[in-house]
């Protein structure tokens, strides 16, 4: 009986990147966490962001960048391609800045490839928004 | 305009308990961190404890855990600090402050004196 | 827990001067470090987040850096207004944690 090889992928256990589309990954992610929790505590700090509305992707790529897909099939984990976080960016960029913040540099969309082929596999994400959204105020106390 | 206004400070007897509330106004205290911080007369910026309440996540520091409790009535979009078993070097000003991106405290409110002393 | 050393406790200097504070971390720690302004009976200010990005609002004249675990905030030219006390602090790894802060007084 031979040590088992080591398990490529690990299930989600960030609850508000579960039922995304997939449901493993592999740490250390594209931040440099090594460990879900820490991941998820740095992502908690964007529900305001989230609830805000900016855009539809953002938590689809935010999720993408701090628990990336895995596959069994392939060594390296699978993030975000550069077009979806472009579009996340220019719909929530100014928004962030009405908060008084700049993009992170963390999410510098030049880090992701810029469209899914075999040469750089990425996550194009849940479909883009063309459609403007409504201005939307910061959400006040009781509103959802 | 976002606010937070801290109220409940005063004087206390060592033992004694008091609750700080900390009422936020412009925002949904539900999506942030909330914490509290005190300083000491002349002393430096201590981290008290912080609330998440999307998630009922709770932390304190070691100096203040098992006597203090912090929580949150987010239909009232307040926050509260629940300090029991009080001593004297808890004698500080309570501050209140938010945080969103990359754990910034970036509104603070104007603070409120708790005194422990016989 | 992180403890984050910060120094010099106090220092002296003019209108006009290039003015340094240091923070270092007793660890390796996220770049989560942000910068704060405290006068005398006002509740501290944000200056600086994420260790090198000015918050909205603040004079450009602040900046912040970071070397390893050495993070440090500079006034490039310290004008009247500036006179206050400077805390860094460290946060989402552990508890957060503030230096012991830095009093800029008038030379």
């Known amino acids: 009986f031979g040590d088992e090889e080591e398990r490529r992928c690990d299930p989600i256990r960030i609850s508000m990147c579960q039922n995304l589309g997939y449901n493993v990954t592999k740490m250390p992610n594209l931040v440099g966490h090594e460990l879900q929790t820490d991941a998820e505590l740095q992502l908690t700090t964007f529900t305001p962001l989230i609830q805000y509305g900016c855009s539809s992707q953002l938590q689809f790529f935010l999720c993408s960048v701090y628990v990336p897909m895995c596959t069994e099939k392939i060594n390296i984990p699978i993030g975000p391609c550069g077009g979806m976080c472009l579009s996340v960016k220019r719909r929530c960029e100014p928004v962030l800045k009405e908060f008084g913040f700049a993009w992170p540099e963390s999410l510098n969309c030049s880090k992701f490839p810029p469209q899914n082929d075999h040469n750089h596999m990425c996550m194009e994400g849940p479909g883009d928004e063309e459609v403007p959204l409504p201005h939307k105020t910061p959400i006040q106390p009781g509103e959802e | 305009e976002v606010q937070l206004v801290e109220s409940g400070g005063g004087l206390v007897q060592p033992g004694g308990s008091l609750r700080l509330s900390c009422a936020a106004s412009?925002?949904?205290?539900?999506?942030?961190?909330m914490h509290w911080v005190r300083q000491a007369p002349g002393k430096g910026l201590e981290w008290v404890a912080s609330i998440y309440s999307y998630s009922g996540y709770t932390y304190y520091a070691d100096s203040v855990k098992g006597r203090f409790t912090i929580s949150a009535d987010t239909s009232k979009n307040t926050a509260y600090l629940q300090m029991n078993s009080l001593r004297a070097e808890d004698t500080a000003v309570y501050y209140c402050a938010r945080s969103s991106f990359a754990w910034a405290f970036d509104y603070w409110g104007q603070g409120t004196l708790v005194t422990v002393s016989s | 827990d992180i403890q984050m050393t910060q120094s010099p406790s106090s220092l002296s200097a003019s209108v006009g001067d290039r003015v340094t504070i240091t923070c270092r971390a007793s660890?390796?720690?996220?770049?989560?470090v942000a910068w704060y302004q405290q006068k005398p009976g006002k509740a501290p200010k944000l200056l600086i987040y994420?260790?090198?990005s000015l918050y909205s609002g603040v004079p450009s004249r602040f900046s912040g850096s970071r070397s390893g675990t050495d993070f440090t905030l500079t006034i490039s030219s310290l004008q009247p207004e500036d006179f206050a006390t400077y805390y860094c602090?460290?946060?989402?790894?552990?508890?957060?944690?503030f230096g012991q802060g830095t009093k800029v007084e008038i030379k």
């Open positions: 412009g925002f949904n205290l539900s999506y942030y961190y």
């Open positions: 660890q390796s720690v996220s770049s989560a």
């Open positions: 994420s260790a090198s």
């Open positions: 602090q460290q946060g989402g790894w552990g508890p957060f944690t």
